[in-house]
């Protein structure tokens, strides 16, 4: 019986051009985490295997950094990064647990202020 639960950062927002840490945490189970897969809709971002290290998908290699821990740091954010992200925990003997994070990438406040105010 699967007793574990995934805690995530839930719905988060970040500024365009900035970075964000995607983090999940598996609790309430003694199951061993063998691997965590990070996905965005149909795309694989990264895999962290407990023993074999990280795999970063080539389409994200220039702006995804592994960690902290089993988390993932997404850099140089664009509006197109808005959407659902999933952390998929492969565990033994429980099986698979999935957590969901919704990221909204906003136009930077600097840009907004720049549009509203003129320098005297």
């Amino acid at each position: 019986m699967m007793t574990g639960t995934i805690e995530t950062t839930g719905n988060i927002s970040a500024e365009k051009g900035g970075s964000i840490i995607l983090q999940c945490h598996l609790s309430s189970t003694t199951a061993q985490v063998t691997q965590v897969n990070w996905e965005q809709q149909d795309q694989l971002l990264a895999i962290c295997n407990a023993d074999l290290g990280w795999h970063i998908s080539p389409s994200f290699k220039d702006r995804v950094a592994p960690g902290p821990g089993l988390g993932l740091t997404l850099q140089s954010l664009t509006v197109n990064d808005t959407g659902e992200y999933f952390c998929i925990y492969h565990t033994y003997p429980d099986g698979t647990y999935t957590g969901r994070i919704f990221l909204e990438v906003l136009e930077s406040s600097v840009a907004e202020h720049g549009a509203r105010f003129q320098i005297p």
Epitope: Q35, N37, L44, I47, N49, D51, L52, H55, I56, H90
Partner: antibody, heavy 119, light 107 residues
Framework: EVQLQQSGPELVKPGASVKISCKTS????????MHWVKQSHGKSLEWIGG????????SYNQKFKGKATLTVDKSSSTAYMELRSLTSEDSAVYYC????????????WGQGTTLTVSS | DIVMTQSHKFMSTSVGDRVSITCKAS??????VAWYQQKPGQSPKLLIY???YRYTGVPDRFTGSGSGTDFTFTISSVQAEDLAVYYC?????????FGGGTKLEIK
């Protein structure tokens, strides 16, 4: 130039053990995971397992747990695979294969070691 | 374990032809798939990964596509030196598994 040089062919008796080596050069040994792959005659490829030379962490295919043991010697930049309680089913070509940087694809392969188990 | 099925064990083609090899995963594997070429008497060689990126030095006649459970490897114009066995492999979850291989024969 990255090279993975495997030990030579082995002819061993059933029930015995064998240790195959994979000596590496041309890169920093501890920075890349090393994997081992089995290819029985005329058949497909099977992943045996992988080892992280930096910390010695291993991941095995359940099918080969108890059959294969993966180790490394950092001082000589060499990976080893020991196979025990050998039977004719273990007769195959065994490859070491190195992954890429933060990539699980097997970018470099050894030349293969042929193991024959026969009485 | 995830089973990778290459439906054709053999494919016969002529020089200059376009050929596609398919690979079906028994479970969802996202884009965690690579393709290898193994010529007679040689070690396998990585051609395509993730599953549409050509490895360094691989000719552009080799392409890959797919996501989820269905993957395709294509040679746009077969050359005599492409005679080999081609394998798909998933690394979405351990144990990482290979397809049974498709042997490309040149007519």
């Amino acid at each position: 130039e990255v090279q993975l040089q495997q030990s030579g062919p082995e002819l061993v008796k059933p029930g015995a053990s064998v240790k195959i080596s994979c000596k590496t050069s041309g890169y920093t040994f501890t920075e890349y995971t090393m994997h081992w792959v089995k290819q029985s005659h005329g058949k497909s490829l099977e992943w045996i397992g992988g080892i992280n030379p930096n910390n010695g962490g291993t991941s095995y295919n359940q099918k080969f747990k108890g059959k294969a043991t993966l180790t490394v010697d950092k001082s000589s930049s060499t990976a080893y695979m020991e196979l025990r309680s050998l039977t004719s089913e273990d007769s195959a070509v065994y490859y070491c294969a190195r992954s890429g940087h933060m990539d699980y694809g097997y970018v470099y392969w050894g030349q293969g070691t042929t193991l024959t188990v026969s009485s | 374990d995830i089973v990778m099925t290459q439906s054709h064990k053999f494919m016969s083609t002529s020089v200059g032809d376009r050929v596609s090899i398919t690979c079906k995963a028994s479970q969802y594997v996202s884009t965690a798939v690579a393709w290898y070429q193994q010529k007679p008497g040689q070690s396998p060689k990585l051609l395509i990964y993730s599953p549409s990126y050509r490895y360094t030095g691989v000719p552009d006649r080799f392409t890959g596509s797919g996501s989820g459970t269905d993957f395709t490897f294509t040679i746009s114009s077969v050359q005599a030196e492409d005679l080999a066995v081609y394998y798909c492999q998933q690394h979405y979850s351990t144990p990482w598994t290979f397809g049974g291989g498709t042997k490309l024969e040149i007519k």
